[in-house]
Amino acid sequence: TLNSVLNSNAIKNLPPPLGGAAGHPGSAVSAAPGILYPGGNKYQTIDNYQPYPCAEDEECGTDEYCASPTRGGDAGVQICLACRKRRKRCMRHAMCCPGNYCKNGICVSSDQNHFRGEIEETITESFGNDHSTLDGYSRRTTLSSKMYHTKGQEGSVCLRSSDCASGLCCARHFWSKICKPVLKEGQVCTKHRRKGSHGLEIFQRCYCGEGLSCRIQKDHHQASNSSRLHTCQRH
């Protein structure tokens, strides 16, 4: 059962923690047994991987989302689940793997050339009235998130950040602009090398929150310039 899995003391031997005060990696004694993760219609086995309990999508990795592991299961227990690949069923964007988004309950590619016509059509449909948003676009958050938002809330159409509620900014999403959450500490951010590069993004991120700046993740200094990962960090 899920509870017995969560209570397992076994943990995979992973690289050292990412810094800060996380200076105490647990002594790995054995690998956890293969665990079943929902992956579309069939369950996929991910060997030697211990479930990671979560409360929000932001706690999970980039290739995961936070949800109850069983359909209609214990609503109080959520873990990070492997993201859904293209053509798999979804309820929100966070469920789909990077490079995909949730459209009509299915993960589809966000490749701008292939899907441009379809996406523009979607935006016209979705923003045709004040009560709908882009195919249930929402922050990477739990399944209880509302699919519809009032003006100024997450997912609402905007022209500038002042149109959005506190804690949100106005950022491009496909070929429209909607209110998105200002980034938290530790979240991946976009560092623009030259002026005007904002215009190239179809999934524009908000800026980092107060007291934070977008800087290279310490562990990624050795990476090549093109692949350096930037995150919101304290000044």
Epitope: P17, A22, Y52, C54, E58, G76, Q187, T231
Partner: nanobody
Framework: EVQLVESGGGLVQPGGSLRLSCVAS????????LKWVRQAPGKGLEWVSH????????MYAASVKGRFTISRDNAKNTLYLQMNSLKPEDTAVYYC?????????????????RGQGTQVTVSS
Amino acid sequence: EVQLVESGGGLVQPGGSLRLSCVASGFTFSMWPLKWVRQAPGKGLEWVSHITSNGDRTMYAASVKGRFTISRDNAKNTLYLQMNSLKPEDTAVYYCARSAGQVVSRASLENDYRGQGTQVTVSS
């Protein structure tokens, strides 16, 4: 720099109670879900409990459900764990932890930010 400092551990008899505290700094406390994990001697990390950023939802491992209560005070940047009806098998070092955020492809307890931990020993 993310810092988490736990306190409140100690030696207690079976059936006794303890209240652990964790003071956090270096990040916006009220914006992050937090958790307690523990590590028994010679064992790996075990998730104990979880609380959402605003404290409206909690989760517990089956082994502690009904005995432990997690809570937080966002005004004081403090996380708590009230432990009642303690058992010898609860003996462990208890860590307050926060996710590292979306900087890894797969999250793991090993990659969390944690404090130094506080020792809880349940013995008669």
